[in-house]
C-alpha cells in the first residue's frame, strides 16, 4: 500500500516570493509522483517545478497559483494510486495603480461647487488601508469639505472649490507591504476671478515688410486686463508704442498686428492676462523674420548610360524650412518614372544619352527662391577620328603620333611605350587633342607605341610602330679641344654612324696635308711622335652617299705634361711660428698653382694677413694656430692637365725645456723654426 509520510498543507504565501508544498511517499515498489492543480496535472516551468516529490515555487503568482493543489502517487506495476489532502495558498499581495476621477464622468464637467470623487486604484490582499495626499500633504478623515471612504478607496470633495486644487496621490499598506499611486491626478478648479487662457499666441514667421498678427485672449469674472510687451519689457499700447514698434496695433479682442515687419521687430512678444484675483498669466510667442540662404554650387556630374544615379540637393538654410523641387528644361520633375524626384534627390534610372543637360534644383520659402544648376553629362565610349599610324621619324627632330578621338565628355588620352606609361617630361608631350610629340627623337625611340582614349563609359586603344631614321652623326662627337703630350705617341679618335657606314677622313683645317708621321686609320688620327708643329686645328669629315657629309672641328694643343719639381712635405710647427709648404711644378703651358686646405680652395685674394702664396707656388702661414692643422693640397694645372700632391701640417705647443735636456737637443720630429 502507498503511504504519505508528509502531506501538503495550506499555507500563507507572499506574492513573488518562494514557497514549497511538501509531499513524501512510502511504497513497497517503485512509484511516480505528480501534482494536480484544480484536478489538472501541473507542468514544470522555471517558476514552478517538481523538486523530488515536493512542488517548489520560485515566485508565487497570485493568479497562476490560486486553486487547490494535490499530490498524487501511482504504482505503475499494480496500478494503485493514492492522493494527498488538498492544499492551497493564502497569497498576500499589494499592487500600485493610478488615482482616477470617479465623479463627475470627465474633467471638463468639474465646476466650482460640484462634488468631486477620486478613487485610489491600489489593491491587495489582505485589503490595505489607504492614505490620501494633496500636494504631498496627508489628508486626515473628517477635515472640512472632504470625506475618505477606506472601503471604497474613495476621496470625496463636497463641494469642491478653488482651494481644493492640487496634485492628489494615495498610498496603501497592508500586512504584505506598502504601495503608492503609479499616476497622480491634478485637480484644477478655477476661481472665476482668475484669468484663464482662451486663445494663446502662436509663433509667427513672416517675410520682410509683410504683416504679422498675434492673437491672445483671456477670460475671468469680472473681465481680466490684457497687456502686450516686447522683448525689452516695453509695453505696447495704441497710445504709447516703443520707437521700433511704430506700426503696432492692439485690437479690442487682444490681437496684436505688426505691419511692415523689419528685422528689429523680430523677437519674443509676451501677452499678460491679469484677473481680479490670482497670479498674472504670461504667454509668449516669437516673431521670426523669414530668411533663405544661398545654395551650394553643384560640381558637374558625368554618368554612364544604363546606370542609375542620384544627385542630392541640399536645401539652403532657411526659415521656414524651404521646400525643394527639381526642374529640367523648365519642367518640374515628377515623383515617379525613369527620371524623377525622390525627397531632395534627383534620380535618373537606366540613364540614356538624351538625359544629358542642365537640371535645376529650386528651393523656396516666404523669404524668396533660390536655384542652382547641375550640368549632367552622359559619357559615351570614344570613337576614332585618327588612329596612330606606323611612322618613320627622323632622329633628332620632333616626331608626332596622332591619337584623335571624340566622346562625351572630352576623352582622356594616355600613351604607352613598350607597355610602359609615358609620363610627360622634357622629351614627351601629349597635346590636348591626344597627339604625342617626341621632342627630339632618339634611335631607341624606335619601338611600339599605344594610345588609350577613355571616358567613364569605356575606352578604346590602338598601337603603332615607330621606325627611327638615323641621321649621319658622330658617335661620340670628338672633343673640340684636346691635348697631346709632347714627344709622345698620341691618338685622336673619330667615329660616326649613319644609314650607310660612313667614310671618315681627317684633314688639317688650313687644307695642308698630314705629315708622314701622322696617319689617318679608319677615323683615328695617329701621331707616332708628337711635335710642336702638330698643334693646330683639324677637321674630321664623315660622309656617305645618301646622307652627305658632316664635319667636326678639333683644336689640338701640344703640351709638356705637368710634373712637380718640389712637393710639400709633412710639416710640424710650433704654435705662433711660421709654416712654409713648398710646391713647384713645371709643364707647358706653364702650370698655375692653387692650394686647398681643410677641404676648401684657398683664394689668394681672400687669404688675409696670415697666409700668402708666393710666385713660385709655395704657401706660407704666419702665426700658426692649432686650427691651421690639417692636410694641404697643392694643385698644379694648365689647359691640358691637372696634378695634385698633398702633405699634412701639424701645429704643436712649444715644450718647456727640462733641465736634463741640454740646450742643443733636437726636437723629436722635423720642425720649422723661425
Amino acid at each position: 500500500a502507498i503511504v504519505f509520510i508528509k502531506q501538503p498543507s495550506s499555507q500563507d504565501a507572499l506574492q513573488g516570493r518562494r514557497a514549497l508544498l511538501r509531499c513524501e511517499v512510502e511504497a513497497p515498489g517503485p512509484v511516480h509522483v505528480y501534482w494536480l492543480l484544480d484536478g489538472a496535472p501541473v507542468q514544470d516551468t522555471e517558476r514552478r517545478f517538481a523538486q523530488g516529490s515536493s512542488l517548489s515555487f520560485a515566485a508565487v503568482d497570485r493568479l497562476q497559483d490560486s486553486g487547490t493543489f494535490q499530490c498524487v502517487a501511482r504504482d505503475d506495476v499494480t496500478g494503485e494510486e493514492a492522493r494527498s489532502a488538498n492544499a492551497s495558498f493564502n497569497i498576500k499581495w499589494i499592487e500600485a495603480g493610478p488615482v482616477v476621477l470617479k465623479h463627475p464622468a470627465s474633467e471638463a464637467e468639474i465646476q466650482p461647487q460640484t462634488q468631486v470623487t477620486l478613487r485610489c486604484h491600489i489593491d491587495g490582499h489582505p485589503r490595505p488601508t489607504y492614505q490620501w495626499f494633496r500636494d504631498g500633504t496627508p489628508l486626515s478623515d473628517g477635515q472640512s469639505n472632504h470625506t475618505v471612504s477606506s472601503k471604497e478607496r474613495n476621496l470625496t470633495l463636497r463641494p469642491a472649490g478653488p482651494e481644493h486644487s492640487g496634485l492628489y496621490s494615495c498610498c496603501a499598506h497592508s500586512a504584505f507591504g506598502q504601495a503608492c499611486s503609479s499616476q497622480n491626478f491634478t485637480l484644477s478648479i478655477a476661481d472665476e476671478s482668475f484669468a484663464r487662457v482662451v486663445l494663446a499666441p502662436q509663433d509667427v514667421v513672416v517675410a520682410r515688410y509683410e504683416e504679422a498678427m498675434f492673437h491672445c485672449q483671456f477670460s475671468a469674472q469680472p473681465p481680466p486686463s490684457l497687456q502686450w510687451l516686447f522683448e525689452d519689457e516695453t509695453p505696447i499700447t495704441n497710445r504709447s508704442r516703443p520707437p521700433h514698434l511704430r506700426r503696432a496695433t492692439v485690437f479690442a479682442n487682444g490681437s496684436l498686428l505688426l505691419t511692415q515687419v523689419r528685422p528689429r521687430n523680430a523677437g519674443i512678444y509676451r501677452c499678460i492676462g491679469q484677473g481680479q484675483r490670482g497670479p498674472p498669466i504670461i504667454l509668449e510667442a516669437t516673431l521670426h523674420l523669414a530668411e533663405i540662404e544661398d545654395m551650394p554650387l553643384f560640381e558637374p556630374r558625368v554618368f554612364t548610360a544604363g546606370s542609375e544615379e542620384r544627385v542630392t540637393c541640399l536645401p539652403p538654410k532657411g526659415l521656414p524650412e524651404p521646400s525643394v523641387w527639381w526642374e529640367h528644361a523648365g519642367v518640374r520633375l515628377p515623383t515617379h518614372g525613369r527620371v524623377y524626384q525622390k525627397g531632395h534627390e534627383l534620380v535618373l534610372a537606366n540613364i540614356a544619352e538624351s538625359d544629358a543637360g542642365v537640371y535645376t534644383c529650386h528651393a523656396a520659402n516666404l523669404a524668396g527662391q533660390r536655384r542652382q544648376d547641375v550640368n549632367i553629362t552622359v559619357a559615351t565610349v570614344p570613337s576614332w577620328l585618327k588612329k596612330p599610324q606606323d611612322s618613320q621619324l627622323e632622329e633628332g627632330k620632333p616626331g608626332y603620333l596622332d591619337c584623335l578621338t571624340q566622346a562625351t565628355p572630352k576623352p582622356t588620352v594616355v600613351w604607352y611605350r613598350n607597355q610602359m606609361l609615358i609620363s610627360e617630361d622634357s622629351r614627351f608631350e601629349v597635346f590636348k587633342n591626344g597627339t604625342l610629340r617626341i621632342n627630339s627623337v632618339e634611335v631607341y625611340d624606335g619601338t611600339w607605341y599605344r594610345c588609350m582614349s577613355s571616358t567613364p563609359a569605356g575606352s578604346i586603344e590602338a598601337q603603332a610602330r615607330v621606325q627611327v631614321l638615323e641621321k649621319l652623326k658622330f658617335t661620340p662627337p670628338p672633343q673640340p679641344q684636346q691635348c697631346m703630350e709632347f714627344d709622345k705617341e698620341a691618338t685622336v679618335p673619330c667615329s660616326a654612324t649613319g644609314r650607310e657606314k660612313p667614310t671618315i677622313k681627317w684633314e688639317r683645317a688650313d687644307g695642308s696635308s698630314l705629315p708622314e708621321w701622322v696617319t689617318d686609320n679608319a677615323g683615328t688620327l695617329h701621331f707616332a711622335r708628337v711635335t710642336r708643329d702638330d698643334a693646330g686645328n683639324y677637321t674630321c669629315i664623315a660622309s656617305n652617299g645618301p646622307q652627305g657629309q658632316i664635319r667636326a672641328h678639333v683644336q689640338l694643343t701640344v703640351a709638356v705634361f705637368i710634373t712637380f719639381k718640389v712637393e710639400p712635405e709633412r710639416t710640424t710647427v710650433y704654435q705662433g711660428h711660421t709654416a712654409l709648404l713648398q710646391c713647384e711644378a713645371q709643364g707647358d703651358p706653364k702650370p698655375l698653382i692653387q692650394w686647398k686646405g681643410k677641404d676648401r680652395i684657398l683664394d689668394p685674394t681672400k687669404l688675409g694677413p696670415r697666409m700668402h702664396i708666393f710666385q713660385n707656388g709655395s704657401l706660407v702661414i704666419h702665426d700658426v694656430a692649432p686650427e691651421d692643422s690639417g692636410r694641404y693640397t697643392c694643385i698644379a694645372g694648365n689647359s691640358c692637365n691637372i696634378k695634385h700632391t698633398e702633405a699634412p701640417l701639424y701645429v704643436v705647443d712649444k715644450p718647456v725645456p727640462e733641465e736634463s735636456e741640454g740646450p742643443g737637443s733636437p726636437p723629436p720630429y722635423k720642425m720649422i723654426q723661425t
Epitope: 627622323e394 633628332g396 631614321l469 667614310t503 652617299g545 652627305g548 657629309q549
Partner: antibody, heavy 121, light 107 residues
C-alpha cells in the same frame, strides 16, 4: 648663286674615251658631293656615280665600274667624269649635279646644263 | 638596288586640271623621295624633297605626300609651263635610283 657649268658637246668614235668637266661656283666646293647622271635620247635618268671633292673618294654604279673615272681639282673647283671604251649606247646627255643634304638624306640641286656626247663611227 | 616605278607613264590634261602622279618603291624608303621636273632640252629641276618639302621658288600648286613605299605628286591647277616630264628619285640608300618618268602633255 650656286651654279654648275659643264664643258661643251663631244663627238667620239667607238672605243674612244671622253672627259667631261663640271665647274662649281657659289658655295664651298669641298662640302658637297658631285654626282653624274646621264640621259640617253628620249630615255630616263641613269645614275653613274659620285665623287667627294673633299677626300677624292668615289662610288660608281656597278654598270660603269672599270669604265668610268671621276676626279676633281679643288684648286679650280672642278669635277671631271671620264668614260672609256665608248659604244653607240653611250650616246647621251651627261649631267653633273650637286648633292644637297640635311644629314638624313639628300637631293640633286642644282644640275649642270648637260653635255651631249655622241658616239658615232 | 631599290626599283622605282612611276604611273602613269604619260597623261594628257588641260590647263586648270588637277593632276596626280604616283611613285612606288620596291621596299620602304621612309620619306626619302624627291621629285624633279624636266622640260625638253633642259636639265632636271628639283620640285619636292623628302616626300613633302617644297623647294624654295617652286609654286605652291605642287604638293608631295606619302611615306614607306607609296608616294604622290599632285599639281592642283595645271599651268602651261607645267607640261613636262616628272621623275621621282629615292635617296634612302646607294645607289640612288630614278623612276622611268611621267610625261604630262597638253590635251
Amino acid at each position: 648663286q650656286v651654279q654648275l657649268v659643264q664643258s661643251g658637246a663631244e663627238v667620239k668614235k667607238p672605243g674612244a674615251s671622253v672627259k667631261v668637266s663640271c665647274r662649281a661656283s657659289g658655295y664651298t666646293f669641298t662640302d658637297y658631293f658631285i654626282h653624274w647622271v646621264r640621259q640617253a635620247p628620249g630615255q630616263g635618268l641613269e645614275w653613274m656615280g659620285w665623287i667627294s671633292p673633299n677626300s677624292g673618294g668615289t662610288n660608281y654604279a656597278q654598270k660603269f665600274q672599270g669604265r668610268v673615272t671621276m676626279t676633281r681639282d679643288t684648286s679650280i673647283t672642278t669635277a671631271y667624269m671620264e668614260l672609256s671604251s665608248l659604244t653607240s649606247d653611250d650616246t647621251a646627255v651627261y649631267y653633273c649635279a650637286r648633292y644637297d643634304y640635311d644629314g638624313y638624306s639628300g637631293w640633286f640641286d642644282p644640275w649642270g646644263q648637260g653635255t651631249l656626247v655622241t658616239v658615232s663611227s | 638596288d631599290i626599283q622605282m616605278t612611276q604611273s602613269p607613264s604619260s597623261l594628257s590634261a588641260s590647263v586648270g586640271d588637277r593632276v596626280t602622279i604616283t611613285c612606288r618603291a620596291s621596299q620602304s624608303i621612309a620619306i626619302y623621295l624627291n621629285w624633279y621636273q624636266q622640260r625638253p632640252g633642259k636639265p632636271p629641276k628639283l620640285l619636292i624633297f623628302t616626300a613633302s618639302s617644297l623647294q624654295s621658288g617652286v609654286p605652291s600648286r605642287f604638293t608631295g605626300s606619302g611615306s614607306g613605299t607609296d608616294f604622290t605628286l599632285s599639281i592642283s591647277s595645271l599651268q602651261p609651263e607645267d607640261f613636262a616630264t616628272y621623275y621621282c628619285q629615292q635617296s634612302y640608300s646607294t645607289p640612288p635610283t630614278f623612276g622611268q618618268g611621267t610625261k604630262v602633255e597638253i590635251k
